[in-house]
Amino acid sequence: RLSPEYYDLARAHLRDEEKSCPCLAQEGPQGDLLTKTQELGRDYRTCLTIVQKLKKMVDKPTQRSVSNAATRVCATGASRWADVCANFMRRYQSRVTQGLVAGETAQQICEDLRLCIPSTGPL
């Protein structure tokens, strides 16, 4: 649960200035599609893929609708992808859900997770 202690710890790690990441990816006009595919961190690319899938799965993002979609988002694709996806969702589901509910773009959500450090590992 999101306890007061969690907030205190998290606040301690937040800088006062706006958080930003040096990501190179750009989204299309709808905020949905990755239009440039530079060398991105594996987790960042995973994040973008999952968030974009979730956006397509829900008509309107609410805590309930995104949470329901989150239980199905990893079910499609190869088993290796399913494992990567499930691992990502275990760590970040609540934050991804909150970002989607608030109307953040996929890029904003994934940058806010600080996942955009380039990585040479495969997806």
Epitope: T62, T97, Q108
Partner: antibody, heavy 123, light 111 residues
Framework: EVQLQQSAAELARPGASVKMSCKAS????????MHWVKQRPGQGLEWIGF????????DYNQKFKDRTTLTADKSSSTAYIQLTSLTSEDSAVYYC????????????????WGQGTSVTVSS | DIVLTQSPASLAVSLGQRATISCRAS??????????MHWYQQKPGQPPKLLIY???NLESGVPARFSGSGSRTDFTLTIDPVEADDAATYYC?????????FGGGTKLEIK
Amino acid sequence: EVQLQQSAAELARPGASVKMSCKASGYTFSRYTMHWVKQRPGQGLEWIGFINPNSGYTDYNQKFKDRTTLTADKSSSTAYIQLTSLTSEDSAVYYCARHPIYSDYGPYAMDYWGQGTSVTVSS
Amino acid sequence: DIVLTQSPASLAVSLGQRATISCRASESVDSYGNSFMHWYQQKPGQPPKLLIYLASNLESGVPARFSGSGSRTDFTLTIDPVEADDAATYYCQQNNEDPWTFGGGTKLEIK
């Protein structure tokens, strides 16, 4: 100190429009969505909708969608609500309230409210 | 829409006694392990003030006399012991589903 300063009371004719403002200070404007809540005299609270200043995303209560427009100006940390085709049913106090985009920014609820703007619709 | 029904609509409690306010949702307001239910206090001529968020978390600066409990559809705000300054109207509010909704309010009078 967090403050949400709302514009002065409005007196309007039926059929007219009003635009109210909510100027935020004391926090990072883009980390919070701005919500609007209506309260008719002696009545309860009704959620109108919210705007995300980061992305421009808006989410409206269907009941208010047709005659309400929410906007925000990041440069001045100000949110606006415009009501059109006013009727006597729109006579109420309108509150703005902030809500964190992510739960590590603060309590995941509307934690600070403006003082309210009173709108009176009368011929 | 999720309908929030508060009871009682009003109550009078003696100074130093316990006040209990109930909020029942027409459907569950729980998602991914959290109950998206919050409690606010409103005094005449003032905006609402956040007391409890996510069903049971006490907002900073709010006295520990206030507590919240519950999950899914049944929630409770408890004030123990009640003080004179607690005379106000209390609202529950959910944001699990659109549109966000408030309960009808409970007016607390101190005897």
